[in-house]
């Protein structure tokens, strides 16, 4: 058992151009706090996957108000360390996520609001009991400087916190075969209870006769390195010179155990010994519980109904994500139609519509004909947010204000001649044709294919088209 400790030194604008705006203002004072999430191994895991090694939240920092016109300085930090206790062995290799959160202290309805300002992540090797390691990470225009270490809690000692120490029974020396516990020279190593031959460097035990392996090691005595990437020789025994073991075919080939689990062969198949926070046949199931406080922003933590979901965060209105860590941007529902711009105002959604569209969701084509009369008896037709006029005969243009040449479209059939007229056009038909557009042939016997011509009009006369 032991504690991972994180000390934040500074959080502020990183070097280079594009300094970030201060997260706080006179109108909206705020304060920072930090969250650290630890996972065993060097796995590339999603930010939302559980913090199987543990998580911690800092205290709130001092309230900060931006000085008008001043660049964002390093922001005031919370006091003290972030401490993540671990119950089992320290895995030696671990992944971390450090989040910087802003608590807004303005006139918030329903209390303060939290928002994620920056998130940094990394994968590191670290021996327990070693000195503080310093680190600098950048997230966008922000820079985070911090130190971290892992230390064992007595009576555990060693790089993995797996060796146990006990007070000396005699003042002068430890019992037979037992060494003093550096750096606690006044204590002695407890008698070994692990399986005989279990690697003192890469193995540990929690019960007598057991040998559990640290990340990167496998085999019954934790003497076999999991990684074989540097082994180029054919399958065979281990090479004493390179320390590289080329495994023979077997159920543990390629280590089927995920998340730092160690594989041991069984008569039929294999067995995974999983680190804390993981279980399942291949250590593929991770389990953070509500006791770890995984829900942010006032999310209610409920224990999952099955091992797959050790907890579920029920998020308050306005937040989402596995840990309620994301503000719901209701604009991601894509509510605005016709290219409208979506604005999530918190209390309501608004769509800012493009020209020619209206309605709460920009769903209506505006009737551009409203108040836009078409001249000279034309009728307005709307469509696609734009209007056009369907003009009466003899007129054209956008608003039917231009006189059109009615003969331009050559409306008279069969060689008839067209004459523009104040009320339209007149066709003078060629011999043998009649009708408004000279469209009807006149029968050879002199009878028309039409009913008798109106009084006063003989077939062949020019006919006016009204």
């Amino acid at each position: 058992a032991g504690v991972f400790e994180l000390q934040i030194h500074s959080f502020g604008p990183g070097p280079g151009p594009g300094a970030p705006r201060s997260p706080c203002s006179a109108r909206l004072p705020c304060r920072l706090f930090f969250r650290v999430c630890l996972k065993p191994g060097l796995s590339e895991e999603a930010a939302e996957s559980p913090c199987a090694l543990g998580a911690a939240l800092s205290a709130r920092g001092p309230v900060y108000t931006e000085q008008p016109g001043a660049p964002a300085p390093d922001l005031p930090l919370p006091d003290g360390l972030l401490q993540v206790p671990f119950r089992d062995a320290w895995p030696g290799t671990f992944s971390f996520i450090i989040e910087t959160w802003r608590e807004e202290l303005g006139d918030q309805i329903g209390g303060p609001a939290w928002s994620l300002l920056a998130r940094v992540a990394g994968r590191r090797r670290l021996a327990a009991g070693g000195p503080w390691a310093r680190d600098i990470q950048r997230a966008g225009a922000w820079e985070l400087r911090f130190s971290y270490r892992a230390r064992c809690e007595p009576p555990a000692v060693g790089t993995a916190c797996t060796r146990l120490c006990r007070p000396r029974s005699a003042p002068s020396r430890c019992g037979p075969g037992l060494r003093p516990c550096a750096p606690l020279e006044d204590e002695c190593e407890a008698p070994l209870v692990c399986r005989a031959g279990c690697s003192p460097e890469h193995g540990f035990c929690e019960q007598p006769g057991e040998c559990r392996c640290l990340e990167g090691w496998t085999g019954p005595l934790c003497t076999v390195p999991v990684s074989t990437s540097s082994c180029l020789s054919p399958r065979g025994p281990s090479s004493a010179t390179t320390g590289c073991l080329v495994p023979g075919p077997g159920p543990c080939d390629g280590n089927p155990c995920a998340n730092g689990g160690s594989c041991s062969e069984t008569p039929r198949s294999f067995e995974c010994t999983c680190p804390r926070g993981f279980y399942g046949l291949r250590c593929e199931v991770s389990g953070v519980t509500c006791a770890d406080g995984p829900c942010f922003n006032g999310g209610l933590c409920v224990g999952g109904a099955d091992p797959d979901s050790a907890y579920i965060c029920h998020c308050p209105p306005g937040f989402q994500g596995s840990n309620c860590e994301k503000r719901v941007d209701r604009c991601s529902l894509q509510p605005c139609r016709n290219g409208g711009l979506c604005l999530d105002l918190g209390h309501a959604l608004r769509c800012r519509c493009r020209a020619g569209f209206a309605g709460p969701r920009c769903e209506h084509d505006l009737d551009d004909c409203a108040g836009r009369a078409c001249a000279n008896g034309g009728t307005c037709v709307e469509g696609g947010g734009a209007h056009r006029c369907s003009c009466a005969l003899g007129f054209g243009g956008r608003d039917c204000r231009e006189r059109a040449d009615p003969c331009a479209a050559r409306p008279c059939a069969h060689g008839g001649r067209c004459y523009a007229h104040f009320s339209g056009l007149v066709c003078a038909c060629a011999p043998g044709y009649m009708g408004a557009r000279c469209e009807f042939p006149v029968h050879p016997d002199g009878a028309s294919a039409l009913p008798a011509a109106p009084p006063g009009l003989r077939p062949g006369d020019p006919q006016r088209y009204l």
């Epitope: 991601s332 529902l333 894509q334 769903e363």
Partner: antibody, heavy 117, light 107 residues
Framework: QIQLVQSGPELKKPGETVKISCKAS????????MHWVKQAPGKGLKWMGW????????GYADDFKGRFAFSLETSASTAYLQINNLKNEDTATYFC??????????WGQGTSVTVSS | DIQMTQTTSSLSASLGDRVTISCRAS??????LNWYQQKPDGTVKLLIY???RLHSGVPSRFSGSGSGTDYSLTISNLELEDIATYFC?????????FGGGTKLEIK
């Protein structure tokens, strides 16, 4: 015309994974979010969440966090629902539906998933 | 979460009848209330959105009304093809929630 066509029925064992598809046609796929709705046998409709078809960002209702994943293949105008580590209680018909800003205006025909050992 | 309650789970009516189905929300949903029809073959269609707006292609015998927490769907002249289950759904607040459904049958 607007259509959402879902993949066929699935029969799975507990612990397995299923991936349901929903192919959209008749409109610009990336202009409308896609939603998923569950209907257990003889029960009502339960909204599972949505995926933004422009950014690919999903949002899940509380009861569907963890084993459920929404995804897209934008080039094929297709949305997917994947359910991992299936359980008997996942037996249901799953619908995809397009959201128009007010309501889910067009629905797929539904995909029946049966989980049985 | 907002609870949606359809108090009548099943309803019998005769062809030509005027039928009203009600739905109540546990809090004000600002008219963001939609009605869906699920036919016996399982297909789901939107009928009414934003309390009273008729979705395209839906017969005008369907209408919706209400405000605040109380809403209703009315079928003015029941036809055989209207035999289905009707669900209300609120779209005001995430997560969206449905009523339990009202099954409409012919007498």
């Amino acid at each position: 015309q607007i259509q959402l066509v879902q993949s066929g029925p699935e029969l799975k064992k507990p612990g397995e994974t299923v991936k349901i598809s929903c192919k959209a046609s008749g409109y610009t796929f990336t202009d409308y979010s896609m939603h998923w709705v569950k209907q257990a046998p003889g029960k009502g409709l339960k909204w599972m969440g949505w995926i933004n078809t422009h950014t690919g960002e999903p949002g899940y209702a509380d009861d569907f966090k963890g084993r459920f994943a929404f995804s897209l293949e934008t080039s094929a105008s297709t949305a997917y629902l994947q359910i991992n580590n299936l359980k008997n209680e996942d037996t249901a018909t799953y619908f995809c539906a397009r959201y128009d800003g007010y309501a889910m205006d067009y629905w797929g025909q539904g995909t029946s998933v049966t989980v049985s050992s | 979460d907002i609870q949606m309650t359809q108090t009548t789970s099943s309803l019998s009516a005769s062809l030509g009848d005027r039928v009203t189905i009600s739905c109540r929300a546990s809090q004000d949903i600002s008219n963001y209330l939609n009605w869906y029809q699920q036919k016996p073959d399982g297909t789901v269609k939107l009928l009414i959105y934003y309390t009273s707006r008729l979705h395209s292609g839906v017969p005008s015998r369907f209408s919706g009304s209400g405000s605040g927490t109380d809403y209703s769907l009315t079928i003015s002249n029941l036809e055989l093809e209207d035999i289905a289950t009707y669900f209300c759904q609120q779209g005001d607040m995430l997560p969206w929630t449905f009523g339990g459904g009202t099954k409409l049958e012919i007498k």
